[in-house]
């Protein structure tokens, strides 16, 4: 007996699609070996139609796929646009030849069933409206009109022209005539449900002179669209329910036996399991909307349905669209930390993976906000200016070729806690979600800058020092000047590096930066940080104010600017710390639910790089231009 298992008999009708699942024993060899689907010929030869090696026969071109699910030990053959010629004997199997392990499948494709000549077939989706057309002769123009539904031999009246309506069709069925038409009446049945399907008879008049028409109503549950996504990637459900529900609340739900549990709706409901990784985006005024879910998990696989109803909940007889989501565990997207922890006043360095084949793509970092349908305004990007409230404390470091970029956020406050998304304008699957948890600091920060009141005088020499603990001894220390398009590394001098590597004096580990001579444009935020290769670690920030020699009062109160890193709430950030004429990025968050477009994030801020020569051991640490 074959260890491969599948459906022995598959029957369908012309024009339909079938999905044939074949199960195989769970072994490493089976998971990785070739999977195939072949058609058995009279001569005993089985001709391959499609295989997991990428082969696709001419007769299956554009209408078939074979997808392996190694984690479930199954593979699925999807065949669309069936014709009667597809009827025959097939094998689904494993192995390098079509003689290995296989299972016999019989496929029968029949014609769409025919009804009596006078039967009109109406095919409608659940929740839609059908208009049944009933013709009659002039002699019955003033006679009673009715529509009944066949149940066995009986025909139960649904609606008639005396204003009778069957209770199960109440508020759903209307009988009417159009304009001056004297030979036709219509019955509308709205909010169709599966039990509405069947044979209807419409009648004008009574007895032998009555005019009768047969109507076969087929009510279709939406055939789920199959979506195959990788673990940790993202999926977008594009929902188009039609104009008639444009003004009703929209929802996406996940089928769970008898119910469909709402994941998100436009009335503000959201399943906690999708917190931080879901966005619902209205597309237009015709009721189109999309739902984006990032950071896909194995348990996200299943049947999903979108719909519309004033309650924001699934309701029988309202239009729906359906999907079946498969989550493939053999993912190309690397596993990255989903929770990053920081402390107030400290910093975090978040590594964002992206498709290494798309190193030139634009990188972004956005803050997921829970309000209503969820949104994700961009905070920083490779060509997006840093958003207000994040000046001096947020930067994106691209590391071309590494398949990752790093986002650093410092001067943390508890208000920074929340969900953030890494995304690019390239491969939309590579969207990752990070939850940032900021706790109150219980000890001094690892990096400390002196002097804390940093005011430099134009034309003079100004040095700031960054004290670091011995645990950072072997790491690379750096100073950088923050600007709206990143933090540009400056020459600096590591005092601690002169010591022997055996001992480490906790009090004398210093990396310093000197501005010589100080210029007006040196004013701004400076960061001291540590890193190992391209792996960024802790940072701390300080605002350096620059004043004229002659002036008695400084341009800015540096204590206020730097207090933010210690204990001031985010809202109290200095207003004048960045030029007000800079272009602020203002990306519409809805663009990020769209797989196709991410708009240019605005003019790039003018670069403000400091450069110079690293100083000698004597302490001359370089200058900024």
């Amino acid at each position: 007996q074959s260890p491969i298992f599948g459906p022995q008999d598959v029957s369908s009708i012309e024009g339909n699609s079938v999905s044939i699942t074949c199960y195989y024993p769970d072994t490493s060899v089976n998971r990785h070996t070739r999977k195939y689907w072949c058609r058995q010929g009279a001569n005993g030869y089985c001709a391959t139609l499609i295989s997991s090696n990428g082969y696709l026969s001419k007769e299956y071109s554009g209408r078939a796929s074979l997808i392996n699910f190694p984690e479930n030990s199954t593979f699925v053959i999807n065949i669309a646009h069936l014709t009667q010629e597809d009827t025959g004997s097939y094998k689904c199997g494993l192995g390098t030849t079509n003689r290995g392990l296989f299972f016999d499948v019989s496929l029968e494709v029949s014609q769409v069933p025919e009804f009596p000549n006078d039967t009109h077939v109406y095919t409608k989706d659940i929740g839609r409206t059908v208009t049944i057309e009933c013709r009659f002769k002039e002699g019955n123009a003033h006679s009673k009109k009715s529509l009944c539904k066949k149940r066995g031999e009986a025909c139960e009246v649904v609606i008639d022209s005396t204003e009778y309506v069957d209770p199960s069709y109440k508020d759903r069925a209307i009988l009417f005539m159009k304009g001056t038409s004297r030979d036709i009446f219509y019955v509308n049945i709205s909010h169709l449900i599966p039990s509405d399907a069947g044979l209807y008879v419409c009648q004008a008049g009574e007895g032998p002179s009555a005019d009768k028409n047969n109507a076969d109503l087929q009510v279709l549950e939406p055939e789920p669209e199959l979506l195959y996504k990788d673990l940790r990637s993202s999926v977008t459900f594009e929902c188009d329910l039609g104009r008639e529900v444009a003004n009703d609340a929209k929802y996406l739900c996940r089928k769970n036996k008898e119910t469909c549990d709402v994941i998100i709706n436009t009335l503000g409901k959201r399943d906690p399991a999708f917190e931080g990784r879901i966005l619902l985006t209205p597309r237009d005024d015709n009721g189109r909307f999309s739902v984006l879910i990032t950071g896909l998990r194995k348990e996200d696989a299943g049947h999903y349905q979108c719909g519309a109803h004033s309650s924001g909940l699934p309701q029988e007889g309202w239009p729906v669209q359906a999907w079946q989501l498969f989550v493939n565990e053999e993912s190309t997207i690397p596993n990255s930390r989903s929770v990053v922890k920081g402390v107030t006043g400290g910093s975090v360095a978040i590594v964002c993976p992206y498709n290494p084949k798309e190193s030139s793509s634009l990188k972004y970092w956005c803050h997921w906000e829970a309000d209503e349908n969820g949104r994700c305004p961009v905070l920083v990007g490779t060509q997006a200016l840093v958003q207000e409230g994040y000046e001096g404390r947020l930067a994106l470091f691209d590391q071309p070729g590494s398949g990752a970029y790093t986002v650093i956020l410092n001067q943390l406050t508890t208000q920074d806690s929340g969900f953030y998304w890494c995304l690019t304008d390239g491969d939309s699957r590579w969207r990752t979600t990070i939850e940032l948890q900021v706790a109150e600091a219980t000890k001094k920060p690892d990096l400390e800058v002196t002097p804390q009141n940093a005011t430099a005088v134009i034309g003079e020499t100004f040095t700031i020092s960054c004290h670091y603990p011995c645990k950072f001894y072997s790491q690379e220390k750096y100073w950088c000047k923050w600007s709206n398009d990143g933090c540009h590394i400056l020459p600096s001098h590591d005092e601690g590096a002169r010591q022997s590597s055996v001992s480490c004096d906790q009090s004398s580990q210093i990396v310093s930066m000197t501005l010589n001579p100080v210029k007006k444009e040196d004013e701004g935020w400076y960061w001291c940080g540590v890193k190992e290769g391209q792996v960024y670690g802790e940072t701390t920030a300080i605002y350096v104010a620059v004043e004229e020699r002659t002036r008695g009062s400084p341009h800015i109160n540096p204590t206020d600017a730097n207090a933010r890193a210690k204990d001031a709430p985010e809202e109290e950030a200095m207003e004048s710390s960045v030029r007000e004429d800079e272009n602020k990025a203002n990306l519409d968050p809805r663009l990020f639910a769209d797989e196709r477009e991410i708009q240019n994030a605005g003019d790039q801020a003018q670069e403000n790089r400091a450069s110079g020569n690293a100083g000698s051991a004597g302490g001359q640490s370089g200058s900024s231009k």
């Epitope: 298992f5 459906p7 022995q8 008999d9 598959v10 029957s11 369908s12 009708i13 339909n16 699609s17 079938v18 999905s19 044939i20 699942t21 199960y23 699910f69 479930n72 199954t74 699925v76 659940i126 599966p194 039990s195 009510v219 279709l220 549950e221 055939e223 199959l226 089928k255 036996k257 008898e258 696989a301 299943g302 049947h303 079946q324 498969f326």
Partner: nanobody, 129 residues
Framework: EVQLVESGGGLVQAGGSLRLSCAAS????????MGWFRQAPGKEREFVAA??????????YYAESVKGRFAISRDNAKTTAYLQMGSLNPEDTALYYC????????????????????WGQGTLVTVSS
């Protein structure tokens, strides 16, 4: 809530035939799955056959041990499944359970009880030699 009621079981001689029925009430599925499992005394519940339907498609699955002898079908009203059993032998003696569900995930193994949400009480089939 869906109720499943099996009928058609009984005592039959080896080589004989029986037709089991499983009537579902409470809800109709426009797409779904109905299956038959059996449990002989002192043994584990085992898969016999299943029928899955969706959008005009029907898929029939059989256990290797009943292939060619048993046939599963359902009526068009989508409420009853049948198991036509032929060439019965004493090893077929068991309590036969009907199980049903809405269409499960495409890659859940239908031979396991897990995908089936609704179960009947069972009908006894005894095959004497």
């Amino acid at each position: 809530e869906v109720q499943l009621v099996e009928s058609g079981g009984g005592l039959v001689q080896a080589g004989g035939s029986l037709r089991l029925s499983c009537a579902a009430s409470g809800r109709t599925f426009s797409s779904g799955i109905m299956g038959w499992f059996r449990q002989a005394p002192g043994k584990e519940r085992e898969f016999v056959a299943a029928i899955e339907w969706s959008g005009g498609n029907t898929y029939k699955y059989y256990a290797e041990s009943v292939k060619g002898r048993f046939a599963i079908s359902r009526d068009n009203a989508k409420t009853t499944a049948y198991l036509q059993m032929g060439s019965l032998n004493p090893e077929d003696t068991a309590l036969y359970y009907c199980a049903a569900d809405e269409s499960p995930s495409r890659y859940i193994d239908l031979r396991r009880p897990a995908p089936y949400h609704y179960w009947g009480q069972g009908t006894l089939v005894t095959v004497s030699s």
